[in-house]
């Protein structure tokens, strides 16, 4: 399974400790050919899907999920999964987002540098939890 469906990785820019009101972007990465990236927020069983996938390198694609103004409620565990037809990948490791009281401007240097979570050992099951509704993404049609 890992050959054509490597586990995705997740990272956060500018980091995983974000001042209240600042922005953060989650970056999900997977192989070339991904149709949909899904960012899951496990603590609330919510997710966001996107088909806005770009090529990060000859062998890697990525999608970016931006939160413009971070609130306390955005703190928690995040992970990525992708759909490369006709298969869902396994989930990435968790990345924890911490939100702290702002002590400076939106881009003050008290954010930690970008952190990421990549592949580790394979989980014993490829089934996941239920999810709550997501935001509307792009529409596409494919033929096979």
């Amino acid at each position: 399974q890992e050959e054509d469906l490597p586990r995705p990785s997740i990272s956060a820019e500018p980091g995983t400790v974000i001042p209240l009101g600042s922005h953060v972007t989650f970056v999900c990465r997977g192989p070339v050919g991904v149709q949909t990236f899904r960012l899951e927020r496990d603590s609330r069983s919510t997710y966001n899907d996107t088909e806005d996938v770009s090529q990060a390198s000859p062998s890697e694609s990525e999608a970016r999920f931006r939160i413009d103004s971070v609130r306390e409620g955005n703190a928690g565990l995040y992970r990525c999964i992708y759909y490369k037809p006709p298969k869902w990948s396994e989930q990435s490791d968790y990345l924890e987002l911490l939100v702290k009281e702002s002590s400076g401007g939106p881009d003050s240097p008290d954010t930690e540098p970008g952190s990421s979570a990549g592949p580790t050992q394979r989980p014993s099951d490829n089934s996941h939890n239920e999810h709550a509704p997501a935001s509307q993404g792009l529409k596409a049609e494919h033929l096979y």
Epitope: Q1, T36, D49, P86, N126, S127, A132
Partner: antibody, heavy 118, light 107 residues
Framework: EVQLQQSGPELVKPGASVKISCKAS????????MNWVKQSPEKSLEWIGE????????IYNQKFKAKATLTIDKSSSTAYMQLKSLTSEDSAVYYC???????????WGQGTLVTVSA | DIQMTQTTSSLSASLGDRVTISCRAS??????LNWYQQKPDGTVKLLIY???RLHSGVPSRFSGSGSGTDYSLTISNLEQEDIATYFC?????????FGGGTKLEIK
Amino acid sequence: EVQLQQSGPELVKPGASVKISCKASGYSFTGYFMNWVKQSPEKSLEWIGEIHPSTGSIIYNQKFKAKATLTIDKSSSTAYMQLKSLTSEDSAVYYCARFDYSNSFAYWGQGTLVTVSA
Amino acid sequence: DIQMTQTTSSLSASLGDRVTISCRASQDISNYLNWYQQKPDGTVKLLIYYTSRLHSGVPSRFSGSGSGTDYSLTISNLEQEDIATYFCQQGNTLPRTFGGGTKLEIK
């Protein structure tokens, strides 16, 4: 409990169209792809295509591209499949099925019998 | 398209028997092989996904094995409620394809 409730049997004339529905309950409708499968005595089970309620993305089996149109209504958690230019070869039972992260059709509707006859 | 072949279209067995149903793919499907049970009333249920993983609520007498192109479903202790038709399905490439089914009957 996950349930997929399909619309009732249809008797339609050759050349006509039919639209069958699949109402989902017991889970987040937008979180899972909805697939459609045809079962006829001659060809067993055939995959028609899938629609992703979250993004609206659709993938068709090339064989059914000119025959089937997949749509969804998120407000009612219902998936639809329209079949057009019907012939006797389209007489079959059609199933909707939820495609899960396990990369399988984990839940199926009860099936809708479509009979094409003059 | 990948062809899925279930060479045995019907199979007779006695209650309590160990029954094995085979499925062959026309090319390597990397273990993306699922098994479904269809009851006489048309109800379809997932039994096993990814070759050998039991779907929730499925009795442990069902098991799956295989690799590459050859796969099998085993019912270790046949019960009356297992009378049904069993289909394999590959999910490695599009279009997803099914085997022709194996109808299991009681002797």
